[in-house]
């Protein structure tokens, strides 16, 4: 068969080869399409209902007025000259609609180093077949699921016309030290071949760099933590940034009870307040920051003291808020 | 709101002529097809004529063909019917019905206007 | 020309009941049928169109169905308001061809 791709809305004309280019004709057309369930014939006598889809025309060939999706399918005459000789014609109709320029929307002005970020969503409106859309940083295209890229896709179908919406969503996690204005575009590649890319027009985004943040440091006293029963235990949590943010104090993983203090004493130490220390900087600008750990214990006499104090790991970092 | 409204129904003699008319509104006239159905009192729906939406085609059962016209106006968003030689069987009400293709059949369709033949 | 048989030609029933008309065309019209009621003095309101699909503002009671060239009209539950008659029409070629006619009456 004789492949034939036409656009939506457009006429299409098939030849019947060898029909006689005049009546009278001994030939028909089936059809096998969207608008039918088996074969539909169509004569040049004919003449009814199916003319505003399909109608044979005085030389025989076949005339669609105005294509559209229920159109794809096969399209086949047999016709027979004035000797008696039969010609068979077999087409294979595929339709296809441009969409509109496709854009982005939702777009961020400004994005932030080594987090993710929605960076905008492309949307593409009717197009057929579907096609795709795929995204561009700087001229080249960003494969989804590497280095930090993210996309979420969404196809939607109209009801009455059949015709595609597509929505792209990106996200991204510029690299700290990356490019300060990346440039994002998007584009939408036909469903069928032959046809160009359409592209949008770029976005440029600001990357912020946010501050690195000086760690949070818990100074125990004494070294080590350690200490005699009744003794006494002094935690000092020291932030170097400005302005000074809220000090709270946790045991074991869980929040203390007390007013929030820079400062933490713990007069005549008993068993009860052996555990693991720390404290959580909470700055306006950056959310919690958790000091490293540090483990509060009690000597019985004549026991020796751990050098350095039995200390755990660095804490969680920057904690996620929710 | 889709409305189509016929007018220029009556009481004719035999062998006269009679011209319906069918105001369409509610829709975009020069997409449809367009047709002509009938009802004789007491009986079912006959197809009387259809045209298609550019007016160029014209369809007709062999029971009024030579006889009635259909035709249209896009620009009056109108649809027509001229009757010619009229008959005491052609006595009935005629409905004007959008459509009459395979994309639409017959969708919506007007109150009707009666046409008498008698002597 | 296409033949539409439609049957029966009317039919007494209740409120409630289950209701079947059937249009059988005398050849292939594919899924060109539309189903129609017409009330005394009133214009056909289509019900049905391509056979199987329910027209806009129509009630789910009504529904349509296709095996090979017979044609089917189901009320699920006869209303008070769906007494009336009930036409097919074939539209897949010309002549255009509706059906007898169904009444529909009370028992």
């Known amino acids: 068969a004789q492949n034939i791709t036409a656009r939506i809305g457009e006429p299409l004309v098939l030849k019947c080869k060898g029909a006689p280019k005049k009546p009278p004709q001994r030939l028909e057309w089936k059809l096998n399409t969207g608008r039918t369930e088996a074969w539909k014939v169509l004569s040049p006598q004919g003449g009814g209902p199916w003319d505003s889809v399909a109608r044979v025309l005085p030389n025989g060939s076949l005339f669609l007025p105005a294509v559209g999706i229920q159109d794809e399918g096969i399209f086949r005459c047999q016709a027979m000259n004035r000797n008696g000789k039969e010609t068979k014609s077999n087409y294979r109709v595929r339709v296809y609609q441009i969409p509109g320029k496709p854009e982005i929307v939702d777009s961020a002005s400004e994005l932030t180093a080594g987090v993710p970020n929605k960076v905008g969503t492309c949307v593409s409106e009717g197009s057929y077949p579907a096609g795709t859309l795929s995204w561009h940083l700087d001229g080249k295209p960003l494969v989804p699921n590497e280095k930090g890229v993210s996309v979420k896709e969404q196809t939607r179908r109209h009801p009455e016309t059949g015709l595609f919406t597509l929505q792209s969503e990106l996200m991204v996690t510029p690299a700290r030290g990356g490019d300060p204005r990346p440039t994002f575009s998007c584009s939408f590649s036909p469903g069928l071949p032959r046809h160009r890319a359409l592209r949008t027009a770029p976005i440029q985004p600001r990357v912020w760099e946010p501050v690195p943040l000086e760690e949070v440091q818990l100074v125990v006293e004494p070294e080590g933590g350690a200490v005699a029963p009744g003794g006494t235990v002094t935690l000092t949590c020291e932030v170097p940034a400005q302005p000074s943010p809220q000090i709270h104090w946790m045991k074991d993983g869980v929040p203390l009870p007390l007013p929030p203090s820079p400062v933490l004493i713990l007069p005549e130490i008993g068993p009860q307040d052996q555990g693991t220390y720390s404290c959580v900087a909470t700055h306006s600008s950056h959310g919690p920051q958790e000091s490293r750990a540090v483990s509060i214990s009690i000597i019985e006499p004549g026991e020796e003291g751990p050098t350095a104090g039995s200390v755990g790991g660095s804490g969680l970092g920057t904690l996620a808020l929710a | 709101e889709v409305q189509l409204v016929e007018s220029g129904g009556g009481l004719v003699q035999p062998g006269s002529s009679l011209r319906l008319s069918c105001a369409a509104s509610?829709?975009?006239?020069?997409?449809?097809?367009m047709t002509w159905v009938r009802q004789a009192p007491g009986k079912g729906l006959e197809w009387v004529a259809s045209i298609d939406n550019s007016g160029d085609n014209t369809y007709y059962p062999d029971s009024v063909k030579d006889r009635f016209t259909i035709s249209r106006d896009n620009a009056k968003n109108s649809l027509y019917l001229q009757m010619n030689s009229l008959r005491a069987e052609d006595t009935a009400v005629y409905y004007c019905?959008?459509?009459?293709?395979?994309?639409?059949?017959?969708?919506?369709w007007g109150q009707g206007t009666l046409v008498t033949v008698s002597s | 020309d296409i033949q539409m048989t439609q049957s029966p030609s009317s039919l007494s029933a209740s409120v409630g009941d289950r209701v079947t008309i059937t249009c059988r065309a005398s050849q292939d019209v594919g899924i060109y049928v539309n189903w129609f009621q017409q009330k005394p003095g009133k214009a056909p309101r289509r019900l049905i169109y391509r056979a199987t699909n329910l027209a806009d503002g129509v009630p789910s009671r009504f529904s349509g169905s296709r095996s090979g060239t017979d044609f089917t009209l189901t009320i699920s539950s006869l209303q008070p308001e769906d007494f009336a008659t009930y036409y097919c029409l074939e539209f897949d070629e010309h002549p255009l061809t509706f059906g007898g006619g169904t009444k529909v009456e009370i028992k």
């Open positions: 019905a959008r459509g009459g293709d395979i994309t639409t059949g017959l969708d919506y």
């Open positions: 509610g829709f975009t006239f020069n997409n449809y097809w």
